[in-house]
């Protein structure tokens, strides 16, 4: 080795006059944030303001009605899922502002970014439960008259939350903080290291259980419901149905970019140009998915205005009107069989 020519090496664009500034990124990108990150910050800010206030209002309106109205139970649980996710936003916002530096520690890294996935699974499972409820109301009104009660609704919600927690565990477990040497930065992310297969498995499970399977089943479910509703020439308000369809549609629209980039990244080589491009878009995709956490209150208000003709009532009473509409099949089981039969015709419109 002594024969190796150890002269001062030529590093190409090496300039001995440069002084090493700790704040200068090594890839010579400036300290200004990238456009996708700026867009993500704007979305996060709007989602936080609308999401916290809107969902808090929804929780307040539905909490009082949840004892007697099943629809209120559904919307209450959806709002709680969204509200919880919004609480992580100030931390995620701060991290992006600091060029994805994560000074909040390992526990926060595992929990906070996982909240949006918990929200995804909780939301889709709750939406599936709500959709099953709408389906039964239309196709099994007598069963609903006998068994559809607040207790069963709460049990269904508890099962949805439990499954959501279970499905979030893999992402939670693989989240780690990594302290990069230069530029000095602590990053929060998932690290599967030796296990590319497991990374793909998690991404596929997330895509299938959190997106494709619900998309297929809910599309079929609402196709049947809407066909029945239209064929029966609905005689009463389809308010709740329209709201639920809007909520379900928004779920799939806003989760699409996250799911597509997620599955692509799991199959790409981490040092490939496409992977690095998708990684730069990651914050934007997450922020786009986060719109789900504030869109529901907006849908409720828009729906309320539509149903009221114009905004005549106060916001709480408008929301109450949309979210706590009692289904035709009441929780009281004192109706006669003939009453239920005559009601069955009208129930198709729910």
């Amino acid at each position: 080795m002594d024969s190796f020519n150890y002269t001062t090496p030529d590093y190409g664009h090496y300039d001995d006059k440069d002084t090493l500034d700790l704040n200068t990124p090594v890839d010579k990108t400036s300290n200004t944030l990238r456009v996708p990150d700026i867009l993500a910050l704007v979305i996060f800010a709007v989602v936080f303001l609308v999401g916290v206030l809107g969902n808090a209002l929804v929780v307040w309106v539905t909490a009082f009605e949840a004892k007697r109205t099943i629809n209120a139970i559904w919307f209450l649980n959806l709002a709680v899922a969204d509200f919880l996710s919004c609480l992580a936003l100030p931390i995620l916002f701060t991290s992006i502002v600091q060029h994805h530096h994560w000074p909040f520690g390992g526990a926060a890294c595992s929990i906070l970014p996982s909240l949006i996935l918990l929200n995804m699974y909780a939301s889709i499972l709750l939406l599936a439960t709500i959709s099953a409820d709408r389906f039964l109301l239309v196709f099994k009104p007598i069963w609903c008259q006998n068994f559809r009660g607040a207790g069963l609704a709460w049990i269904a919600c508890a099962v949805a939350w439990g499954l959501a927690l279970l499905l979030t565990i893999p992402s939670f477990l693989y989240r780690v903080v990594r302290e990069e040497y230069f530029p000095p930065k602590v990053l929060c992310g998932v690290d599967y290291s030796h296990d590319k297969r497991r990374e793909r498995a998690v991404a596929i499970v997330r895509l299938v259980l959190g997106f494709l399977w619900p998309l297929l089943t809910l599309t079929i479910c609402y196709t049947f419901i809407l066909l029945r509703t239209w064929s029966r020439r609905a005689t009463r308000s389809t308010k709740t149905l329209k709201v639920v369809v809007a909520v379900v549609a928004s779920f799939f629209i806003f989760w699409l970019p996250y799911q597509v980039t997620g599955i692509m990244m799991s199959f790409l080589e981490p040092s490939s140009p496409t992977f690095l491009l998708l990684k730069k878009l990651d914050s934007l995709c997450v922020s786009f998915a986060y719109i789900n956490c504030c869109i529901n209150p907006i849908i409720y208000v828009v729906a309320g205005q539509g149903f009221q003709g114009r905004l005549r009532k106060s916001l709480p009473s408008l929301l109450r009107n949309v979210l706590t509409e009692e289904s035709v099949v009441r929780e009281s089981k004192s109706f006669t069989r003939s009453t239920v039969d005559t009601m069955a015709q009208k129930t198709q419109a729910v």
Partner: antibody, heavy 125, light 112 residues
């Protein structure tokens, strides 16, 4: 010609402290971070930390945080490592090593392009 | 800390032979900028380590082209196409993606 000149040997008693030096020549001292690496006899290499001579900014391996202090003297282009509370575990060769300075994807201060010849620290009562 | 595992620990070769040393990290070494900051050093008896390869596959100034490096993520390899007498010594891999910087335990290249 880049050179990092270290004193050949140092001797200290357990519990005492020692200051090892590394004199740089052949380049602008303040333009390059200086790292320190420990190698126990017949063992692998262990990173201690680095110092940026231009502003005194330093960063340590947690294993050495309480017992190693890195300093520089710009006037004499010399880097120092001060080790306190010495134990027999500190008996090792201590290297200073320079990192290159360049703003490019593969470059930056990521690898040690020049090393000192090492100082053997003997801890003996 | 990132643990760097080298294999084999000892590699007996005949001069002119090919040699291959493997280095595996306990965590991915892919930096947020896409680079793998994995380097190879050679230390001869009584000398300080000398840089051979930096950032996986870049030969340092004055290093012969018989040395080549490859790999990404957690698995890396140093290859010597035709071993010469001056190549004998202990080879260390090192990562500088994450803090603390860490080194492999070394692979001793020796004559059979």
């Amino acid at each position: 010609q880049v050179q990092l000149q270290q004193s050949r040997a140092a001797l200290a008693k357990p519990g005492a402290s020692v200051k090892l030096s590394c004199k740089a020549s052949g380049y602008t001292f303040t333009n390059h971070w200086m790292h320190w690496v420990k190698q126990r006899p017949g063992q692998g290499l262990e990173w201690i930390g680095y110092i940026n001579p231009i502003n005194g900014f330093n960063r340590y391996n947690q294993n050495f945080k309480d017992r190693a202090t890195l300093t520089t003297d710009k006037a004499s282009s010399t880097a120092f490592i001060h080790l306190n509370g010495l134990t027999y575990e500190d008996f090792a060769v201590y290297y200073c090593a320079r990192v290159p300075l360049s703003y490019g994807g593969s470059y930056g201060p990521y690898f040690f392009d020049f090393w000192g010849q090492g100082t053997i620290l003997t801890v003996s009562s | 800390d990132v643990v760097m595992t080298q294999s084999p620990l000892s590699l007996p070769v005949s001069l002119g032979d090919h040699a291959s040393i493997s280095c595996r990290s306990s965590q991915s070494l892919i930096h947020s900028n896409g680079n793998n900051y994995l380097h190879w050093y050679l230390q001869k008896p009584g000398q300080s380590p000398k840089l051979l390869i930096y950032t996986v596959s870049n030969r340092f100034s004055g290093v012969p082209d018989r040395f080549s490096g490859s790999g990404s993520g957690t698995d890396f390899t140093l290859k010597i196409s035709r071993v010469e007498a001056e190549d004998l010594g202990v080879y260390f891999c090192s990562q500088s993606t994450l803090v603390p910087l860490t080194f492999g335990s070394g692979t001793k290249l020796e004559v059979k």
